[in-house]
């Protein structure tokens, strides 16, 4: 039950981008695929009211008339549990300069719902995607990205925030999920595993991929992230799976080659602007979409997730660099930073293409379980 391999004409990143559809039956999850805790690693750095931003924080995505002290992505407080994790994995996020903040961590106590009640919500992320159960929705048009090809200057902030590596994006990166569903990109970050252990957040028919990229967007209907949190469609995340391929991905290398500089938790560097769209699959027309949540506290719901069907290819060395370079909290390796998949609880994952037909010989026609969520927007 795997989708047919896609023959891509113009591979991303100098020939090492995603040619493959993210399905495979030979790689079903083992017990080691994710940490045993209910809420293993994951990260979406978002702002909270008690944490006013410093100069170094993400540029505002807001009208020019907005007051100066407004909140920015990355400013939400996070919560850390005492004690050490049972497994050698990432736990707390502790900036060297900001020990006065509260923090969350992966594994152990307290459970995330105690950190943020929304983490016990019914519509959480990530989820396991089963293409043959996805509802084909013709109304889901190809994604539109505008302004993602950034010039080298101004440079962008690349930061090891203790639970991921995050690239802060400048104003002007516009994304449309469809007519009237417009967003501005705020930041991107990655999730990964460890040696021999995949670390994507979403899974496909139980298959966990080596890594996953998230590009986080704020709806143009909101001036600030804190206003959008928990509001349906207030935030949107584009997600793509990263897989091992034979060649180096030149787009990703522009970031991965700089990880050594930010190995220490809380450290950051400036990197030249790059083509952000080159970090994503080239096929913007085939994707899965559902409404979920942030994958870490505060776990706010109402987030529109768009998961590309096509994967992005990185070399084995690049994936190794990603999982093996950074230090996280508690003086441990920054690894396995993904959350366990969460129950759908009746949600239907939509597909922009007839995924059920391609992925299963038993499926005779596209599954049309309900009307498209996107229809009529």
């Amino acid at each position: 039950q795997r989708l047919p391999r896609m023959q891509e004409d113009s591979p991303l990143g100098g020939g090492s981008s995603g040619e493959d559809d993210p399905l495979g039956e030979e790689d079903l999850p083992s017990e080691e695929d994710s940490p045993r805790e209910e809420d293993p690693p994951g990260e979406e750095d978002l702002p909270g009211e008690e944490d006013l931003p410093g100069e170094e924080d993400l540029p505002e995505v807001k009208p020019k008339s907005e007051e100066e002290g407004s909140l920015k992505l990355e400013d939400l407080p996070t919560v850390e549990a005492p004690g050490d994790p049972q497994e050698p994995q990432n736990n707390a996020h502790r900036d060297k300069e900001g020990d006065d903040q509260s923090h969350w961590r992966y594994g152990g106590d307290p459970p995330w719902p105690r950190v943020s009640p929304a983490c016990a919500g019914r519509f959480q992320s990530p989820v396991d995607i089963r293409p043959q159960l996805a509802a084909f929705c013709p109304a889901l048009r190809p994604l539109e990205l505008l302004g993602f090809q950034l010039p080298p200057l101004p440079e962008l902030r690349l930061r090891n925030n203790g639970h991921s590596v995050q690239l802060t994006l400048p104003p002007g990166l516009e994304m449309a999920l469809g007519p009237g569903r417009e967003y501005r990109a705020l930041q991107l970050h990655l999730h990964w595993g460890a040696a021999g252990r995949p670390g994507s957040e979403h899974t496909v028919e139980g298959h966990r991929f080596p890594a996953e990229i998230h590009v986080v967007h704020l709806s143009t209907a909101f001036a600030r992230v804190d206003e959008a949190l928990g509001r349906p469609g207030g935030l949107a995340v584009l997600a793509a799976f990263l897989e091992e391929g034979p060649e180096e991905n030149s787009a990703y290398e522009q970031l991965l080659s700089r990880l050594e500089e930010i190995a220490e938790e809380g450290s950051e560097t400036q990197v030249p602007g790059l083509d952000i769209s080159a970090l994503l699959p080239s096929d913007f027309s085939r994707y899965f979409q559902y409404e979920g949540s942030l994958t870490t506290p505060p776990c706010a719901q109402g987030v529109i997730w768009t998961v590309f069907n096509q994967t992005v290819m990185l070399s084995a060395k690049q994936l190794h660099t990603l999982s093996d370079t950074l230090w996280g909290p508690g003086d441990s390796r920054l690894q396995l930073n993904f959350r366990a998949t969460q129950p759908l609880n009746g949600r239907v994952i939509e597909a922009s293409f007839p995924a059920g037909v391609d992925s299963s010989p038993r499926a005779a026609e596209p599954v049309q379980l309900n009307s498209c969520l996107a229809a009529g927007d």
Epitope: P88, A194, A195, E260, E264, S267, D324, T325, D331, R333
Partner: antibody, heavy 118, light 107 residues
């Protein structure tokens, strides 16, 4: 090939500051982590700390309050300062280069002996 | 801090012998363990990194294995130049720690 050479006074008085410099030759100091390790006579190895060429540091907690590391990329050098020394700081001090990922030390200086005595 | 222990602390062996040195971590360190050889009056030399990867130029008689908390360095046929002290070092924690060393001398 890259070579490392430690230099500094071989004798330091108690309560004073030990200062050592490691000079990197045969290659650039840039884009690497560099480390200091010490070894008291007849004893094992103790990691002191590391520094990246950007100046980012990480120190052994047992020495953190007394250690300062710095880097001078223009001179291809990095240095160690250890304040308020006592006789327990008498050791052979090594500088070494770290391999990112495994974080093993693949190139070492020959070591310099520092004695703390009045 | 992660504590590292080695056993034995010393051993006597003959040329040609198979020698096994064990290193144990106080908590799981995955495969983040490096092995060094140090001869008297010399700096340590990296032999094996991440538990089992032989560094270039190191003879193939040296091998490493293990993961989690228990690791082994094996010298399959001891040579005269192998008489030295061997140290393990963990790099799972960013606060690196070494084992106390195992001295291999001539029987």
């Amino acid at each position: 090939q890259v070579q490392l050479q430690e230099s500094g006074p071989g004798l330091v008085k108690p309560s004073e500051t030990l200062s050592l410099t490691c000079t990197v030759s045969g290659g650039s100091i840039s884009s690497y982590y560099w480390s200091w390790i010490r070894q008291p006579a007849g004893k094992g190895l103790e990691w002191i700390g590391r520094i990246y060429t950007s100046g980012s540091t990480n120190y052994n907690p047992s020495l953190k309050s007394r250690v300062t590391m710095s880097v001078d990329t223009s001179k291809n050098q990095f240095s160690l300062k250890l304040s308020s020394v006592t006789a327990a700081d008498t050791a052979v001090y090594y500088c070494a280069r770290l391999i990112t990922g495994p974080y093993g030390m693949d190139v070492w200086g020959q070591g310099t002996t520092v004695t703390v005595s009045s | 801090d992660i504590q590292m222990t080695q056993s034995p602390s010393s051993l006597s062996a003959s040329v040609g012998d198979r020698v096994t040195i064990t290193c144990r971590a106080s908590q799981s360190i995955s495969s983040y363990l490096n092995w060094y050889q140090q001869k008297p009056g010399k700096a340590p030399k990296l032999l094996i990194y991440t538990a089992s990867n032989l560094r270039g130029g190191v003879p193939s008689r040296f091998s490493g294995s293990g993961s989690g908390t228990d690791f082994t360095l094996t010298i399959s046929g001891l040579q005269p130049e192998d008489f030295a002290t061997y140290y393990c070092q963990q790099s799972y924690s960013s606060l690196f720690t070494f084992g106390p060393g195992t001295k291999v001398d001539i029987k």
